[in-house]
């Protein structure tokens, strides 16, 4: 989902070329603005580069979408660990509490 | 294949303007920050201006803030310079040059395309 | 605003000898906003390097670029006939401007 920008613009030129999911670190889109009237897409590759992509791309508009699936999966994950973690420690405590009857 | 064509240089008095052209082909013009450089004669590289592919971003040089104006047309796929209150100072071969795929704030990718240069002399 | 220093002003070398040119920055530059442009007499600059150490298009890798901070380098390991030539470094600044170093003239011995 687009952010909104604080600054002015920072894409001078951008690119075309496809960019492969596995290469990429981040990917921030920012939304217009009254100091940017224009949608910037920003990507960080694993190995540091940043790179200005062409939001009307057909292959950025699909890599966006695969880099907003990829993003909500891992989230999903990590929100699935969490439970299971809770779940684990609720184990645990019912497991003390009934120690504590048994003595 | 990928092309700058420089026109509009020639020979004006002090104080007087001038706009130079440049015209792109073989790339999606508007896909690119473009630039103007130039090199008075026997003299090292000076960067003039620069605009970006939208025409959002755009930045001038000390030495011709308030008289140069840089400009383009995507829909002709040509860039512009246009140069008031000009001075002997300004006499150069003028350069116009494409910023490389992607360039930011954040990261420069150098100019990858340069034309040959449009030279103006300013004498009286 | 940055002002970029190159050296030697001119290197006097022969054709298979390594060249190295240093460019300084008057203060700190972030490495990924510097290049390196090679002209020739009577014709237009030629991209190098960008990002201080990555090679453009179809640039032979005889020519690399290092450095950080405020010091730079493009070295050319083995100079060829085609090498002998004016090498600026050229730095970009927020603003945004773009500053170019006065130019190290590579000459036959």
């Known amino acids: 989902t687009p952010v909104v920008r604080k600054g002015r613009c920072s894409c001078i030129s951008t690119n075309q070329g496809t960019i492969h999911l596995q290469s990429l670190k981040d990917l921030k889109q920012f939304a217009p603005s009254p100091s940017c009237e224009k949608i910037e897409i920003i990507a960080t590759l694993k190995n540091g580069v940043q790179t200005c992509l062409n939001p009307d791309s057909a292959d950025v508009k699909e890599l966006i979408k695969k880099w907003e699936k990829q993003v909500s999966q891992k989230k999903k994950q990590k929100n699935g660990k969490k439970h299971q973690k809770k779940k684990v420690l609720k184990v645990r405590k019912s497991q003390r509490s009934r120690q504590k009857k048994t003595t | 294949q990928v092309q700058l064509v420089e026109s509009g240089g020639g020979v004006v008095q002090p104080g007087r303007s001038l706009r130079l052209s440049c015209t792109a082909s073989?790339?999606?013009?508007?896909?690119?920050?473009m630039h103007w450089v130039r090199q008075a004669p026997g003299k090292g590289l000076e960067w003039v201006a620069v605009?970006?592919?939208?025409?959002?971003?755009?930045g001038y040089a000390d030495s011709v803030k308030g008289r140069f104006t840089i400009s383009r047309d995507n829909s002709k796929n040509t860039l512009y310079l246009q140069m008031n209150s000009l001075r002997a100072e300004d006499t150069a071969v003028y350069y116009c040059?494409?910023?490389?795929?992607?360039?930011?704030?954040?990261?420069?990718?150098?100019?990858?395309?340069w034309g040959q240069g449009t030279t103006v002399t300013v004498s009286s | 605003e940055i002002v970029l220093t190159q050296s030697p002003g001119t290197l006097s070398l022969s054709p298979g000898e390594r060249a190295t040119l240093s460019c300084r920055a008057s203060?700190?530059?972030?490495?990924?906003?510097l290049a390196w442009y090679q002209q020739k007499p009577g014709q237009a600059p030629r991209l190098l390097i960008y990002?201080?150490?990555s090679r453009a298009t179809g640039i032979p890798d005889r020519f690399s670029g290092s450095g950080s901070g405020t010091d730079f380098t493009l070295t050319i390991s083995r100079l060829e006939p085609e090498d002998f030539a004016v090498y600026y470094c050229?730095?970009?600044?927020?603003?945004?401007?773009?500053?170019f170093g006065p130019g190290t003239k590579v000459d036959i011995k």
């Open positions: 040059a494409r910023e490389g795929a992607g360039s930011s704030v954040y990261y420069y990718y150098g100019m990858d395309v």
């Open positions: 203060q700190s530059v972030s490495s990924s906003y």
């Open positions: 605009i970006g592919y939208g025409g959002l971003i755009k």
């Open positions: 990002g201080a150490s």
């Open positions: 050229q730095q970009y600044g927020s603003s945004p401007i773009f500053t």
């Open positions: 073989g790339f999606t013009f508007s896909d690119y920050g």
